[in-house]
């Protein structure tokens, strides 16, 4: 809107900068135990996992970035049992990572997006 | 604290996912009204910027990922008052960039992170 | 299994430094942070503070601050506390401990006795 | 700093029998995120400390089930079951919710 008004090399790296913070997946850090919900008696090694999810801005205040498909990575980790009555086992855990991301006008309701084999 | 039990490969594998996510400065998208506090008529565009932030995990579930150290970026943004009495105005907001993280035990009260010219 | 050996028992005088170790093993060494405890004869538990051994970071007691410094050698899996400007009350046994990520101290090395006296 | 007061300092008690302490901090244990991070530590005479209970009810690896820990907020509780001789020694609760973590002055637990 105010391309007579400045130069076109600002302008240019405004849009970039837009681009960039658009509503994608993005490298983020899940705590497992938190996306399983809560149990008192069950750990996981390591308790984070990097995964792709939805981020970023959407054009519009109303819309929220949100997933439109999704993959599911295994991650191997060590499932501990309290009290610990035996090895920590190594188990798949599937994880959800985001591959589609759109601007939608409402949240549905999040489903839980770990898997347990 | 399995090592005797697994392949080597596998725990090198585990291991590097947990380096991954461990706290460290990421880039992250913020909304740039929402940082300097609510206004209703002034708004930016691009409403989102760029910027690194703490994120990750901790080695501990007490410790929070927060930032010890910042510099400011300036983000040249068009600032528009509402209702729409003038052009645009091209403003350099300077944005917080975090430069370095730490896990520390409680979380402080969060300043703003933007600094306004 | 999981193992903190700890360097053997020292002597020292008042005002000197001494430095202790605490070699780990059977587990990911800078998945966890590593705890410094004392303990005088007869006495209770007393934290001194940790380092989180995958970047250095420290978070000492105040009590201990400007006399205490963790570090660790990754090359290695052995973390180091050394402690300055000794005195008479500084004699205890000074132990290692593993925290585990939900808390508590899971592993404890058998501790370095330190006897400070002139 | 969060003080941690233990009760009783001494417990004689008999083969058998049940045995409880008390652990008091100063100051609420309930994190920010929830959690409480209360935990019971054991030592033995000679030997180094070990955890027996963290975040106020999870048994550590190994430990028997006679021993159990309750509470919430500011006030705890160790429980054994039936003491065997092996329990005598000095029992310790910590916490680490806040910094510097704190323990308690320890509670000796001694056959009658």
């Known amino acids: 809107f105010a391309a007579t008004f400045y130069d076109i090399e600002t302008l240019k790296v405004i849009d970039e900068e837009w681009q960039r913070t658009q509503c994608s997946p993005r490298e983020t850090c899940v705590e497992v135990a938190s996306e399983l919900g809560k149990s008192t008696n069950t750990f996981f090694k390591p308790p984070c996992v990097n995964v792709f999810r939805c981020g970023g801005c959407c054009n519009e205040e109303s819309l929220i970035c949100m997933n439109t498909s999704t993959s599911y990575i295994s991650k191997q980790l060590f499932e501990i049992s309290v009290p610990l009555t035996s090895v920590p086992e190594l188990v798949p855990v599937k994880v959800a990572n985001h591959t589609g991301c759109k601007c939608l006008p409402t949240a549905p309701r999040h489903p839980y997006s770990i898997i347990r084999r | 604290f399995a090592a005797t039990f697994y392949d080597i490969e596998t725990l090198k594998v585990i291991d590097e996912e947990w380096q991954r996510t461990q706290c460290s400065p990421r880039e992250t998208c913020v909304e740039v009204a929402s940082e300097l506090g609510k206004s209703t008529n002034t708004f930016f565009k691009p409403p989102c910027v760029n910027v690194f932030r703490c994120g990750g995990c901790c080695n501990e579930e007490s410790l929070i990922c927060m930032n010890t150290s910042t510099s400011y970026i300036s983000k040249q943004l068009f600032e528009i008052s509402v209702p729409l009495t003038s052009v645009p105005e091209l403003v350099p907001v300077k944005v917080a960039n975090h430069t370095g993280c730490k896990c520390l035990p409680t979380a402080p009260r969060h300043p703003y992170s933007i600094i306004r010219r | 299994q999981v193992q903190l050996a700890q360097s053997g028992a020292k002597v020292k005088q008042p005002g000197a430094s001494v430095k202790a170790s605490c070699k780990a093993s059977g587990y990911t060494f800078t998945g966890y942070n590593m705890y410094w405890v004392r303990q005088a004869p007869g006495q209770g538990l007393e934290w001194m503070g940790y380092i989180d051994p995958y970047n250095g970071d420290t978070t000492y007691n105040q009590k201990f601050k400007g006399r205490v410094t963790m570090t660790t050698d990754t090359s290695t899996s052995t973390a180091y506390m050394e402690l300055r400007s000794l005195r008479s009350d500084d004699t205890a046994v000074y132990y290692c401990?593993?925290?585990?990520?939900?808390?508590?101290?899971?592993?404890w090395g058998r501790g370095t006795l330190v006897t400070v006296a002139s | 700093d969060i003080v941690m007061t233990q009760t009783p300092l001494s417990s004689p008690v008999t083969l058998g029998q049940p045995a409880s302490i008390s652990c008091r901090s100063s100051q609420s244990l309930v994190h920010s995120n929830g959690n409480t991070y209360l935990h019971w530590l054991q030592q033995r005479p000679g030997q180094p400390p070990r955890l027996l209970i963290y975040?106020?009810?999870n048994r550590s690896s190994g430990v028997p089930d006679r021993f159990s820990g309750s509470g919430a907020g500011t006030d705890f509780t160790l429980k054994i079951s039936r003491v065997e001789a092996e329990d005598v020694g000095v029992y310790y609760c910590s916490q680490s919710t806040h910094v510097p973590r704190t323990f308690g002055q320890g509670t000796k637990l001694e056959i009658k």
């Open positions: 975040k106020v009810s």
């Open positions: 401990a593993r925290t585990s990520y939900y808390g508590g101290m899971d592993y």
